[in-house]
Each structure stands twice: as structure tokens, then as C-alpha cells.
């Protein structure tokens, strides 16, 4: 067990041109806060995958109001560290996401509004117990400077926080099979930490986090007796005849979840699903209010003014979950038309359109010819590859200003061969195609046994049916 600690040093405009506008103004004062999300390993995980190592939210920073005409300075930061406790071993390699959030303090209906200012992410190697590591990350025009470290919580030590150290019981040496704890030579290595909840009477471990059962016991936590009973009694051992497995007391027996939480068994022990307003391993921590900022990703917190009343997070588009912690993959609906690339930015969907298309969903086919003149006798049409102009023989380029090979733009469709001719280019069509540019199949794949061709899209160079 241990704690990952993050210290934010500064958040402000990065070097170079294009300084960002201040996020706050005299009309809309605001303050910053930060969220950190940690995941084990170096995998290139999606931003919305769970923060398996943990997450933390900073306090709110001081209120900031922009000075008119002044460039955006480094913004005032919240006090203190962001701390992410981890229960198991520190993985050594981890991925992080640090989000900078703005809380606007204007006169919004329903209280303050939150919006994501910047998100940085990275993958790092880090040994627990080491010194602070410094880092600089840029997100757009913003720059975030921070330090981080992982430290073990006593009695755990080591680069993964898996070794335990306890004060020596005898002044001279450690117990049998236990070594002194470097660098704490006055302490001794303690036995391994088994899986949480592993039965101290019936279970043991040889590796941190495991739970191996003594003979006669089973289950993930060695709490289930293996009995050879007739299986008539619901629990407990019985006469040795039939060799049945009788469940012993399960981890959810007696419901360890407080405050109305529901218990479900897991391979490791149990898990509590807590009602709104409670959290913790056993739903024992209460008193989350809107003042604690429980809604992530710009969710609006309503109710929960006092610890006894539940809060509700109203999530912005693209997020769901009781705390708006889950991102909806809106790109899976393929909202971008005409081959546009979908980008889910969290606060909005963006479509990055292919050349020649525009609009929020790339739904508009641009009129490339509007206000465009073609030189050297060219005529403006959309077509023939990337050219906006259909150029006269011997000219090419976007505006027909360059002397060029008229066949370079592949002007003949469906595998037609292009020839430069004194009167212009000539397409020699492949068998079965006709038209000045071979764009018309004479009999489109036309077996008479085919049903009337279905509507819609057919890749056409060469033409084929899907």
C-alpha cells in the first residue's frame, strides 16, 4: 500500500506564439482545480477507461479575475498535493491523465459551471520511495509543470511497496527467515501481505496479494470448508461419505456494506455498490456534497447541500454515470459524413472533414469553383483527382498555371488509358466502358441473372459490386 503524490507547480501559457486567452474575466471570475487519473502499465489506454490505480480531485484554487489588457499569466493554483492512495503493490510503470478544470463563478442558474481547460497524459516508469520527478506537459497553448512521486505507507517498503518492515523485537537480529530492511537496518522485513481478506487461519501466501488455502479449505479467501458431507445441512462439515463441497461463510455474509450498499463477491473478496452520497470500501464514508465537486467532466451538481441529502450529477453530452465519470463513445455512431474523421473532445464532438467537405458533420460538399478562376483556358469543375480546374492541354496545377502532363491527374476512369493529344487529352477506355473519360460502364457487371442492383454506394475504380 502507498500513496501517489502530485504537486502542480504552474499552469499557464506555454512558450511560443499564440498565447491563450485568459480563462477568466472580470465578468466571469473563475478558479482552477485539477483531476488526476492513474492506470497501471504503459498501455495506450483510452481516456475513458477506468482509473484502475485511482483518481483524485484537488481543492479549488483562489478566485482569479483577469486584468484587462494584461496577458494571461500563470494562474493561481490550489494549495496542497493531489494524493492517490493505492492498496496493492505499486506497478512501477503507470499511465496518467491530468485534467485542468475551470470553475466559473458568474451568475449561472444552478450554481457554478465547470469546463475542461486542458488535458495532458503520459506514460512513465517510477519506483516507489524515489525522489520527486519533475515534468512539463503541453496541451495546446497551455503548459503544465508538475512533480510526482510514489511513496509507501508504513509498514510497506521497497520499490513496489510489497515488503513490510517492522521494528525489531530483539536488538541483535531479525526473526527466522526475515532479513533486515535496508535502508532501515533497525527494522526487519515482515511476512508478506496476502490478498485482502485472506483467512489468517486457513490461508497463506508466498507472493504478495495471493491467497493459498490450507488443506480442507477453498474459495478465493480460503473461507469455504471442503466437506465430505451428505450435503443436507446448508453449511458446515458433516459425515465423510459423499464428497460434496459445502459453502462456508461467504465474504458477503452479514452484508459488510454499510448505509444501504449492496454486496457482491469478487475473486479478491467483495465489492460494495454504494448509494449516492456514500463511498469507501464498505460505503462507510458519507457526507459527499456538491461542495466536494463529485461530478466529473463538467457535470452539474444539484442538491446535496448538506451531508444528509443526496446530490445528483447532471452530465454534459457525452458523459454518463452517477458522477459523470464514464464517457459515451459518441463516435461509434459514425456522425461524420463523407469520410470525415470523428474526434470526441469530451465537451464536444468534432468532425475533421476531408478536403472539399465542410460543416459540423462534413455534410456540405463545397463548391470548389466559387470565386475561382482557372488560367490558360481551364474550366472549373470538381473532379480528376485533386484538381479544381480542368486544364487545357499542356497546363496543370490547381489553377492551370503550371505546364503539366494532362494525364498526371488520372483523368480516365475505370482503368482507361490517357493519351496527350494536340486537341486535348484522349481516354482509351477499357473494354466495357465508354464516355469521354470512361466514366460509364456499358453493362455494369451486368449478368442478367443479377437482381436489380441495390441502391447506394459502389466503389468505382474499377467498378465492382460488394
Amino acid at each position: 500500500a502507498g500513496v501517489f503524490e502530485l504537486q502542480i507547480h504552474s499552469f499557464g501559457p506555454g512558450p511560443g506564439p499564440g498565447a491563450p486567452r485568459s480563462p477568466c474575466s472580470a465578468r466571469l471570475p473563475c478558479r482552477l482545480f485539477f483531476r488526476v487519473c492513474l492506470k497501471p502499465g504503459l498501455s495506450e489506454e483510452a481516456a475513458e477507461s477506468p482509473c484502475a490505480l485511482g483518481a483524485a480531485l484537488s481543492a479549488r484554487g483562489p478566485v482569479y479575475t483577469e486584468q484587462p489588457g494584461a496577458p494571461a499569466p500563470d494562474l493561481p493554483l490550489p494549495d496542497g498535493l493531489l494524493q492517490v492512495p493505492f492498496r496493492d503493490a505499486w506497478p512501477g510503470t503507470f499511465s496518467f491523465i491530468i485534467e485542468t478544470w475551470r470553475e466559473e463563478l458568474g451568475d449561472q442558474i444552478g450554481g457554478p459551471a465547470w469546463s475542461l481547460l486542458a488535458r495532458v497524459a503520459g506514460r512513465r516508469r517510477l519506483a516507489a520511495g524515489g525522489p520527486w520527478a519533475r515534468d512539463i506537459q503541453r496541451a495546446g497553448a497551455w503548459e503544465l509543470r508538475f512533480s510526482y512521486r510514489a511513496r509507501c505507507e508504513p509498514p510497506a517498503v521497497g520499490t513496489a511497496c510489497t515488503r513490510l518492515c517492522r521494528p525489531r523485537s530483539a536488538p541483535s537480529r531479525c526473526g527466522p527467515g526475515l532479513r533486515p530492511c535496508a535502508p532501515l537496518e533497525d527494522e526487519c522485513e515482515a511476512p508478506l501481505v496476502c490478498r485482502a481478506g485472506c483467512s489468517p487461519e486457513h490461508g497463506f501466501c508466498e507472493q504478495p496479494g495471493e491467497c493459498r488455502c490450507l488443506e480442507g479449505w477453498t474459495g478465493p479467501l480460503c473461507t469455504v470448508p471442503v466437506s465430505t458431507s451428505s450435503c443436507l445441512s446448508p453449511r458446515g462439515p458433516s459425515s465423510a461419505t459423499t464428497g460434496c463441497l459445502v459453502p462456508g461463510p461467504g465474504p458477503c455474509d452479514g452484508n459488510p456494506c454499510a448505509n444501504g450498499g449492496s454486496c457482491s463477491e469478487t475473486p479478491r473478496s467483495f465489492e460494495c455498490t454504494c448509494p449516492r452520497g456514500f463511498y469507501g470500501l464498505r460505503c462507510e464514508v458519507s457526507g459527499v456534497t456538491c461542495a466536494d465537486g463529485p461530478c466529473f467532466n463538467g457535470g452539474l451538481c444539484v442538491g446535496g447541500a448538506d451531508p444528509d441529502s443526496a446530490y445528483i450529477c447532471h452530465c454534459p453530452p457525452g458523459f454518463q454515470g452517477s458522477n459523470c465519470e464514464k464517457r459515451v463513445d459518441r463516435c461509434s455512431l459514425q456522425p461524420c459524413r463523407n469520410g470525415g474523421l470523428c474526434l470526441d473532445l469530451g465537451h464536444a464532438l468534432r468532425c475533421r472533414c476531408r478536403a472539399g467537405f465542410a460543416g459540423p458533420r462534413c455534410e456540405h460538399d463545397l463548391d470548389d469553383c466559387a470565386g475561382r478562376a482557372c488560367a490558360n483556358g481551364g474550366t472549373c469543375v470538381e473532379g480528376g483527382g485533386a484538381h479544381r480546374c480542368s486544364c487545357a492541354l499542356g497546363f496543370g496545377g490547381r489553377d492551370c498555371r503550371e505546364r503539366a502532363d494532362p494525364c498526371a491527374a488520372r483523368p480516365c476512369a475505370h482503368g482507361g488509358r490517357c493519351y496527350a493529344h494536340f486537341s486535348g487529352l484522349v481516354c482509351a477506355c477499357a473494354p466495357g466502358y465508354m464516355g469521354a473519360r470512361c466514366e460509364f460502364p456499358v453493362h455494369p457487371d451486368g449478368a442478367s441473372a443479377l437482381p436489380a442492383a441495390p441502391p447506394g454506394l459502389r466503389p468505382g475504380d474499377p467498378q465492382r459490386y460488394l
Epitope: 469543375v381 470538381e382 473532379g383 483527382g385 476512369a413 466514366e439
Partner: nanobody, 117 residues
Framework: EVQLVESGGGLVQPGGSLTLSCAAS????????MAWYRQAPGKKRELVAG???????IYIDSVKGRFTISRDNAKNSVYLQMNSLRAEDTAVYYC???????????WGQGTLVTVSS
């Protein structure tokens, strides 16, 4: 993606006239080479008439002088004016588009033309 919707088909007597319309969406017809095809029962689909992106037209021999293909950029539509219709013109007529930028082809659903007395 380009969508094509044909209309104007129906029953007509030999020697009569019909005009087929093909309304395009998703791209301007000025940017497309468009054509009309037809498929009679038990036969291959065949090209009838085409109009290139630059406005040049093409017809198969059996309809030359009787059919005219045209384009209306403002209405984003292509038309096939069919005069002096014959029984052998009976078929399902399909609108076709070739998009130069993507080099993809598109088809409409088809409209039935029946020439019968």
C-alpha cells in the same frame, strides 16, 4: 455519400413521351458524371445516356434522336426526356453517378417504365 432518387416512370403508349427525373443529394450534380441505365426483364443492365461533369453527353445508338439527357444545377437533378417510345424501351430505369473526387459510383433504386398499348 451521394443519394439518388428517381421518379417519373409509369405506363405510356407506344409513340408517347415521358420525362424521368433523378434528384441527387450529398453532392452537386455539377461535380458528378451522371447517366441513365435500364434493365429489361431477363437482360443485362445497359447504359442509355450519360452526361459528364464537363457537360458532354453520350447516347447508345438505339435511343439517339429520341432521348435527351440534361442537367439542372439549381435543382441538383438530372433528367431523361424520352420521346417516340417503343415497346422495347420497357425496363426499370436506374440513375447512376460517378464521383470524380472519390472515384466511387452510386445507384438509385430504379423507376419502372412500361410502353404498352
Amino acid at each position: 455519400e451521394v443519394q439518388l432518387v428517381e421518379s417519373g416512370g409509369g405506363l405510356v403508349q407506344p409513340g408517347g413521351s415521358l420525362t424521368l427525373s433523378c434528384a441527387a443529394s450529398g453532392s452537386s450534380v455539377r461535380f458528378l458524371s451522371m447517366a441513365w441505365y435500364r434493365q429489361a426483364p431477363g437482360k443485362k443492365r445497359e447504359l442509355v445516356a450519360g452526361i459528364s461533369a464537363d457537360g458532354s453527353t453520350i447516347y447508345i445508338d438505339s435511343v439517339k434522336g429520341r432521348f435527351t439527357i440534361s442537367r439542372d444545377n439549381a435543382k441538383n437533378s438530372v433528367y431523361l426526356q424520352m420521346n417516340s417510345l417503343r415497346a422495347e424501351d420497357t425496363a426499370v430505369y436506374y440513375c447512376y453517378a460517378y464521383r470524380w473526387r472519390t472515384r466511387y459510383t452510386y445507384w438509385g433504386q430504379g423507376t419502372l417504365v412500361t410502353v404498352s398499348s
